[in-house]
C-alpha cells in the first residue's frame, strides 16, 4: 500500500518485498508545534522480569550464559495499560495509589508530566515525519545487525504487560547505527490501533499506519538501562510500520499465533527463538533518524530513533489478531496503545537517502529544505 501522493521511488512502502515507497512528500506546513489531541499517548517497554518504567522495559545486561532470559530488568516500576480508550487521548492514567511511573495508562488523568516530568520535555517521541523536510545525510550508512537469527532454543518470553505485547530478547543481538555506535537489543514490542483504526506511533505526513514494531537497544557504552536513561544515544529504537498486505507474514505469525495464550494482562508464554531480523523490513539502508524519547513514562530523552522507510506487510487477519486479542487492565481491550505525535521543537529529522526529492512530474526540481547536520564521509 502506498501513502497518498506517493512518488514512484518514494519512502516507506512495500514491506519486506523490497519495493521502496517513500513516506510521501513533505511540503505541507509543519504541525510540530501542535501535538494532536486525537492521538493517544504511547508506551513502550523494555524486557526483563519486571516491566520497566516506560515505553521500553529496560533490563540490566548480564553475561550470556545465565538463565534463559539472561537480561534481568532493573527494579523499575511496572506499567499499567489504559482502559480501552474510545478516543485516543493525550494523557496517561495512574492508579490512585501510585505517584511514580509504576501506574499509568493511556487516556485520562493525571497528565503524563505529573507521572514523569520528562514527559513534558522539548524533544519527545513519537513525531510526524515529513520526508521533504528531512535532511539527507550520506553519512548514515546501512544498519548492521548481528546475531538476530535465533535458534528455536532457548525459548523467548512473550508477555502481555498490559500496555503492549513484548518479546524479551537474549544477549548477543548486536546492532550498529554506524562506526562506533554499537548497541545490544533488549526487547521488542508492538503498538496498534483497533478495528478500522490505525495505531502506529510515528506518522508520515500525518498518515498513521496500522501498527508499528519497536526493537529497543542499549548502547554498549552502558551496562544497565538505568545508567543509559536520559543519556544522549544511551538507548536506540528501531521502528518499522506494519501495513496490510495480501499474504500472511510467516515471521510475525510465530508470535501472533501465540497471543491467545497471553490474552490476559500480565500473562506470559515461552516461544521458540526465531529470526528477529525477519520482523523488520529487508532494506536496512533507507531510514529516517532523529533524537527523541521513550514514548511512555518516564519519557526519558536522548533516545536515537531509526524509522525504516520500508514497511512490513501483514495480512488483514494478522493485523486483526494483533489488535483484537489482548486485554489490558480492568476488563478492557488492549487497543490504541500509542502516544500522540510530539512537536519537533526545532529538531531536524535526518534521512539516509534523498527522501525529499520528488520524482513525480509535479516537482520541477528537487526540494531539500534541511541540510545534514553530520558531514558525509
Amino acid at each position: 500500500q502506498r501513502l497518498p501522493r506517493m512518488q514512484e521511488d518514494s519512502p516507506l512502502g512495500g514491506g519486506s518485498s523490497g519495493e521502496d515507497d517513500p513516506l510521501g512528500e513533505e511540503d505541507l506546513p509543519s504541525e510540530e508545534d501542535s501535538p494532536r489531541e486525537e492521538d493517544p499517548p504511547g508506551e513502550e517497554d523494555l524486557p526483563g522480569e519486571e516491566d520497566l518504567p516506560g515505553e521500553e522495559d529496560l533490563p540490566e545486561v548480564k553475561p550470556k550464559s545465565e538463565e534463559e532470559g539472561s537480561l534481568k530488568l532493573e527494579d523499575l516500576p511496572t506499567v499499567e495499560a489504559p482502559g480501552d480508550p474510545q478516543e485516543p487521548q493525550n494523557n496517561a492514567h495512574r492508579d490512585k495509589e501510585g505517584d511514580d511511573q509504576s501506574h499509568w495508562r493511556y487516556g485520562g488523568d493525571p497528565p503524563w508530566p505529573r507521572v514523569s516530568p520528562a514527559c513534558a520535555g522539548r524533544f519527545q517521541s513519537p513525531v510526524d515525519i515529513r520526508p521533504q523536510l528531512a535532511a539527507f545525510c550520506p553519512a548514515l550508512r546501512p544498519l548492521e545487525l548481528l546475531g538476530f537469527q535465533l535458534p528455536p532454543l532457548p525459548e523467548l518470553r512473550l508477555r502481555n504487560n498490559g500496555h503492549s505485547v513484548q518479546l524479551t530478547l537474549p544477549p548477543g543481538l548486536e546492532m550498529a547505527l554506524g562506526p562506533g555506535r554499537e548497541y545490544r537489543a533488549l526487547q521488542l514490542h508492538l503498538h496498534w490501533g483497533a478495528a478500522g483504526r490505525p495505531g502506529s506511533e510515528h506518522t508520515v505526513e500525518g498518515h498513521r499506519f496500522p501498527a508499528e514494531i519497536h526493537v529497543v537497544h542499549l548502547s554498549t557504552a552502558f551496562a544497565r538501562v538505568d545508567e543509559a536513561l536520559g543519556r544522549p544515544g544511551g538507548l536506540a529504537v528501531l521502528a518499522a510500520f506494519l501495513e496490510e498486505g495480501p499474504e500472511e507474514n510467516s515471521a510475525y505469525e510465530q508470535l501472533l499465533s501465540r497471543l491467545e495464550e497471553i490474552a490476559e494482562e500480565g500473562s506470559e508464554t515461552q516461544v521458540p527463538g526465531l529470526d528477529i531480523s525477519a520482523l523488520l523490513p529487508s532494506d536496512f539502508s533507507r531510514y529516517f533518524q532523529y533524537e527523541g524519547s521513550l514514548t511512555t513514562p518516564p519519557c526519558a530523552q536522548g533516545v536515537i530513533w531509526t524509522v525504516f522507510n520500508q514497511t512490513v506487510m501483514l495480512s488483514a487477519k494478522q493485523l486483526h489478531t494483533l489488535s483484537d486479542t489482548l486485554w489490558g487492565p480492568g476488563d478492557s481491550r488492549l487497543q490504541l496503545n500509542f502516544r500522540a505525535t510530539q512537536p519537533l521543537n526545532g529538531r531536524v529529522i535526518e534521512a539516509s537517502f534523498p527522501a525529499g526529492v520528488d520524482s513525480s512530474p509535479r516537482a520541477a526540481e528537487p526540494v531539500q529544505l534541511n541540510s545534514c547536520l553530520a558531514a558525509g564521509d
Epitope: K64, E68, P152, P154, E155, G172, P272, S277
Partner: antibody, heavy 116, light 111 residues
Framework: QVQLVQSGGGLVQPGGSLRLSCAAS????????MSWVRQAPGKGLEWVSA????????YYADSVKGRFTISRDNSKNTLYLQMNSLRAEDTAVYYC?????????WGQGTLVTVSS | QSVLTQPPSVSGAPGQRVTISCTGS?????????VHWYQQLPGTAPKLLIY???NRPSGVPHRFSGSKSGTSASLAITGLQAEDEADYYC???????????FGGGTKLAVL
C-alpha cells in the same frame, strides 16, 4: 555450581530400549533448555535431541526421530532420553547438556552399546 | 559427512598461534546463526570454549578467540601450550535441517 550427573547407559540388543537420565543441580532447571548429544567411538559429536525449559517444545535429529523421546521432570530437576528400536549405529557415549548460549555445561557421559 | 567442515588436524609448536576453520553454508553460519566452539580433552566431556562467535565463558584463557565472516568461522589459539592438545568442535544451528549441527572436529597436536 552447575552439575549434570548422568545414568542409565549399558548394553542392549538391537531393537531394544533404554532410558537415560540426567540429574541437574546448581541452577534453576526449569529456566533452561536441555539437550542430548552423542559421540560414537572414535567419532565426532552429533546432536540428538533438545527440549525447552517448560518441556513444551521438543526437537530431534532425523536419525532418531520416531524412535527417541526426550522429556523432563522439572519437579525432580531431571532430563530423560527414552530410546526405543535401538540400532547398532546408536552405539555412542551420550551426553546431556544445558542449552543456553551454546551447550554451556555437559554431563560426564554414559556409554550405550547396542550389540547382539 | 558433517554439515560444518573442519580440518581433521592442525598442529603447532608451544608458543605458536594456530587457527581452526569451520566452514558452513547459507542455511547455518551464512544465515547469521551464532557459532560456538568446544574443547574436548582426551577421555572427558566437551567444554564450551567460545560462545556466540566471539565470547569466552569465564575461566577460558584469553589465548582462545573466535571470529566469523560470511559462511565461515575460526578459532584462534595463541601462545600454544601442551595442555591445549585436544579435539575442537564448532557448532551452530541449521535452518534447513532444523537441527543443531557440529563440525567433524579438529585434533590439535602440540609438537
Amino acid at each position: 555450581q552447575v552439575q549434570l550427573v548422568q545414568s542409565g547407559g549399558g548394553l542392549v540388543q538391537p531393537g531394544g530400549s533404554l532410558r537415560l537420565s540426567c540429574a541437574a543441580s546448581g541452577f534453576t532447571f526449569s529456566s533452561y533448555a536441555m539437550s542430548w548429544v552423542r559421540q560414537a567411538p572414535g567419532k565426532g559429536l552429533e546432536w540428538v535431541s533438545a527440549i525447552s525449559g517448560s518441556g513444551g517444545s521438543t526437537y530431534y535429529a532425523d536419525s532418531v526421530k520416531g524412535r527417541f523421546t526426550i522429556s523432563r521432570d522439572n519437579s525432580k530437576n531431571t532430563l530423560y532420553l527414552q530410546m526405543n528400536s535401538l540400532r547398532a549405529e546408536d552405539t555412542a557415549v551420550y551426553y546431556c547438556a544445558r542449552a543456553a548460549a551454546g551447550f554451556d555445561y555437559w554431563g560426564q557421559g554414559t556409554l550405550v552399546t547396542v550389540s547382539s | 559427512q558433517s554439515v560444518l567442515t573442519q580440518p581433521p588436524s592442525v598442529s603447532g609448536a608451544p608458543g605458536q598461534r594456530v587457527t581452526i576453520s569451520c566452514t558452513g553454508s547459507s542455511s547455518n553460519i551464512g544465515r547469521g546463526y551464532n557459532v560456538h566452539w568446544y574443547q574436548q580433552l582426551p577421555g572427558t566431556a566437551p567444554k564450551l570454549l567460545i560462545y556466540d562467535d566471539t565470547n569466552r565463558p569465564s575461566g577460558v584463557p584469553h589465548r582462545f578467540s573466535g571470529s566469523k565472516s560470511g559462511t565461515s568461522a575460526s578459532l584462534a589459539i595463541t601462545g600454544l601450550q601442551a595442555e591445549d592438545e585436544a579435539d575442537y568442535y564448532c557448532q551452530s544451528y541449521d535452518s534447513s535441517l532444523r537441527a543443531w549441527v557440529f563440525g567433524g572436529g579438529t585434533k590439535l597436536a602440540v609438537l
